[in-house]
């Protein structure tokens, strides 16, 4: 029961953070105007990974794709990459997830299967989560940076006389989206790995218990019919997941390279 | 066709507030659009005073802040200003407008003369 | 506050003349997110409220003669009209449309010689 509860909250929790990559991935306001300590203009300007914004205040809206490849940034390119890979691998991870959930029978599917599906689908959740997190922290670092440059010589004087304010962006809200979906699918996918690890068939661990029958003496061992219903390869299963959770707490580790923010 | 007509009291005392109303036909204040309080001085100074916009915000000219208040009756489809301790330099032309939106273009009321004299 | 300074303060013309006007703000009204420059110009005639002729610097309004054109960026802009006709002697204004408060310059005054 447990184990399906917990199965069944992975998934819902990777979906939602899914829908929040895709979301945050498709969002105008990566990047917003600073409004902080600015002179108050009558036009707001917003970007995004695939197209730039200004809304003037009389709320008209103009939003211009950036319709070159070669032209961008190489680290806006990666951050579309990382969101795209993100977005691809959760896609996947949730097919793959809906055949694995416990509470859905389909044909003669062994637990055996489902603990393996549920593996898999856990792991695409916990590198999608952790592309969103990576995409949407090289790019916040993209803004810092370029914060701090703009700040530097926010006032480019011609000889003192005329002023040219420039335009400073700061965190929009796509990159908050980004990081709670990220870190949904994150938890989702940790989720659904310990769910496989109470879906995989483990030997019963009941002492034997000896039946005395004439003449005999038989041990009985339950579980022993199990091994030789194709079971039987359960300690390997057994190790295969353990090599997972190791795995996990690797990948786990990695996003402290991108926490510079 | 949208129109606007200011309406007001042409002459008021210094010290006095002074309101003036721009009615508007053929478009809602509400839908869109900012609406400015424009005015122009005896010797052809143009000066923005301020808006407010569709959805009930204003901006005002902070040489004006303390002084200036626009509002609106949406029911009536009207926006007002209203200015108060007014002095002598306040004597103008004050026009009410309709704010460019992207390429769509502006409207002006014909203007209402203001006299501030004791 | 944006000062916007225009020059002449008046020009005396004949009509057919090609008439050029500047104005200069103290600050560059460039948008970087749309590549746009934010002055207006308008023309007032006597007794009439300002009517819009060009904005975004450069973009005329429907139903404005191409005998007015706009250029320019940052902070130097020019008011050209080719051609001058009787209709177009008015006084002329440019405007910072992106800084507020919102200002006007104090006109160019257009008059037949």
């Known amino acids: 029961m447990a184990v399906t509860a917990c199965q069944g909250l992975g998934f819902v929790v990777s979906l939602i953070g899914i829908a929040g990559i895709i979301a945050a991935t498709c969002m105008d306001q990566w990047s917003t105007q600073d409004l902080y300590n600015n002179p108050v203009t009558a036009v707001f300007n917003y970007q995004g990974l695939w197209r730039s914004c200004v809304r003037e205040s009389s709320g008209f809206t103009e939003c211009r794709g950036y319709f070159t490849l070669l032209g961008l940034p190489a680290m806006l390119q990666a951050v579309r990459a990382l969101m795209i890979v993100g977005i691809v691998l959760g896609a996947i991870g949730l097919l793959v997830s809906i055949f694995a959930l416990k509470c859905i029978r389909i044909g003669s599917m062994e637990d055996s299967a489902k603990a393996n599906m549920t593996l898999t689908s856990g792991i695409m959740f916990i590198v999608s989560g952790l592309c969103a997190i990576a995409g949407v922290s090289v790019f916040a670092n993209m803004l810092v940076t370029n914060f701090w440059m703009s700040t530097a010589n926010m006032y480019t004087g011609m000889g003192g006389m005329v002023q040219t304010v420039q335009t400073r962006y700061t965190f929009g809200a796509a990159l908050f989206v980004g990081w709670v979906a990220g870190g949904l699918t994150l938890i989702g996918g940790v989720m659904m790995c310990i769910a496989c690890r109470g879906l995989a068939p483990e030997e019963t661990n009941y002492k034997a218990v000896s039946y005395h029958a004439s003449g005999h003496s038989v041990a009985y061992k339950p579980g022993g019919f199990k091994a030789s219903t194709g079971f039987g390869s359960n300690t390997k299963n057994k190790k295969i997941y353990d090599g997972g959770a190791r795995t996990e707490d690797e990948v786990q580790s990695y996003p402290s390279k991108h926490d510079y923010v | 066709d949208v129109q606007l007509q200011e309406s007001g009291p042409g002459l008021v005392k210094p010290s006095q507030s002074l309101s003036l109303t721009c009615s508007v036909t053929g478009y809602s204040i509400t839908s869109g659009y900012l609406w400015n309080w424009i005015r122009q001085s005896p010797g052809n100074k143009l000066e923005w005073m301020g808006h407010i916009t569709y959805d009930g915000s204003n901006n005002y000219n902070p040489s004006l802040k303390n002084r200036i208040s626009i509002t609106r009756d949406t029911s009536k489809n009207q926006f007002f200003l209203k200015l108060n301790s007014v002095t002598t330099e306040d004597t103008a032309t004050y026009f009410c407008s309709r704010g460019r939106y992207g390429n769509n273009r502006d409207y002006w009321g014909q203007g209402t003369t203001l006299t501030v004299s004791s | 506050d944006i000062v916007m300074t225009q020059s002449p303060s008046s020009l005396t013309v004949t009509s057919g003349e090609k008439v050029t006007m500047s104005c200069k703000s103290s600050?560059?009204?460039?948008?970087?997110?749309?590549?746009?420059?934010?002055l207006t110009w308008y023309q007032q005639k006597l007794g009439q409220p300002p009517k819009l002729l060009i904005f975004?610097?450069?973009t005329r309004e429907s139903g404005v003669p191409d005998r007015f054109t706009g250029s320019g960026s940052g902070t130097d802009f020019t008011l050209t009209i080719s051609s001058v006709q009787t209709e177009d002697l008015a006084v002329y204004y440019c405007q910072n449309d992106y800084y507020y408060p919102l200002t006007f310059g104090a006109g160019t005054k257009l008059e037949l010689k």
């Open positions: 600050q560059s009204l460039f948008n970087s997110g749309n590549q746009k420059n934010y």
């Open positions: 975004w610097a450069s």
